[in-house]
Amino acid sequence: EVEKTACPSGKKAREIDESLIFYKKWELEACVDAALLATQMDRVNAIPFTYEQLDVLKHKLDELYPQGYPESVIQHLGYLFLKMSPEDIRKWNVTSLETLKALLEVNKGHEMSPQVATLIDRFVKGRGQLDKDTLDTLTAFYPGYLCSLSPEELSSVPPSSIWAVRPQDLDTCDPRQLDVLYPKARLAFQNMNGSEYFVKIQSFLGGAPTEDLKALSQQNVSMDLATFMKLRTDAVLPLTVAEVQKLLGPHVEGLKAEERHRPVRDWILRQRQDDLDTLGLGLQG
């Protein structure tokens, strides 16, 4: 808390500029008008203020906007955003994607902080759903974002947003999350032609039921082992040896290297040895 002192003669700031870096903390408090700061927030980032000085500027904004900052100020916070607490951010009403991008840019290259998580939560709740543009933006900054959401939160993702999802965005998703995303992906891609459809849906197949895998096994898809290893164990277990052979096509030989890992291990144990022997891979049930 900075003590209230009168501004020395001739030091009253008429604009936010580089001369302010030479002000002591108490001088910033006394000589910078909060309303001026709010209207010239975009200049703050161009000035090499110390962290202590930024604390003073934040304090001034807090006094001016006790109920939370307006979006016109939030959009230009820049590095001052790093000074905000989740409690501060919960008071905000962020509706512009440009504002969100500007603040995510400040945190770029770092782990998702509690501040960023709160900001995203406020933004998405304000929009009512995770639309395509938002998802596009969030996964560009945080590829693991989608998989950080609960299945309940994912259920509010509209199928149209699935077009923004890249394979790497799903790398850390667990089966419960893919169970929610797979039907949305099916809906999103349902009008694509065959080979293009399979390329798009492949990343989501960890949520596919047995009947879809059976159907795909009859259509020369040549699923790679990496995709097969991410399938739900309960969806793979009912597949016959012939179906798995057709599903994987030339990649079936890769089963040998994965025979000790799920779901391959559990699937092998469900098959008759005679059927496994038809693969010629030396798999032991």
Partner: nanobody, 128 residues
Framework: QVRLVESGGGSVQAGGSLRLSCAAS????????MGWFRQAPGKEREGVAS????????NYADSVRGRFTISQDNAKNTLYLQMNSLKPEDTAMYYC?????????????????????WGQGTQVTVSS
């Protein structure tokens, strides 16, 4: 997952008509196939007609072409089989089935081994 329930079967005189319905519950997508199949006592299950849910493709067995019409109501997730000019040899248990993922329309041909989801069936009896 898709569950299928048939209705509309019954007994009819030769030359008469029946309309079978199949209600699909669960997720129905455009890139799915739905079809009608039948099995007479002591015979193998055979394809009657099929349709690509996304539209633009129907397929009929030679024995029913021109007499039977397959159609769908996407809003109600319901498949229909309008059967006209029925013959005694049409007597069978009629099944509705689905292929949950079809990468091409052509894959929707009414070949029983391709279909992964089946209803319980509805009996059609045609007397001469």
């Amino acid at each position: 997952q898709v569950r299928l329930v048939e209705s509309g079967g019954g007994s009819v005189q030769a030359g008469g008509s029946l309309r079978l319905s199949c209600a699909a519950s669960g997720n129905v997508y455009n890139n799915m196939c739905m079809g009608w199949f039948r099995q007479a006592p002591g015979k193998e299950r055979e394809g009657v007609a099929s349709i690509y849910v996304g539209g633009g493709y129907t397929n009929y067995a030679d024995s029913v072409r021109g007499r039977f019409t397959i159609s769908q109501d996407n809003a109600k997730n319901t498949l229909y089989l309008q059967m006209n000019s029925l013959k005694p040899e049409d007597t069978a248990m009629y099944y509705c089935a689905a292929i949950t993922v079809a990468l091409t329309r052509a894959f929707c041909a009414p070949i029983p081994s391709r279909y992964t989801n089946w209803g319980q069936g509805t009996q059609v009896t045609v007397s001469s």
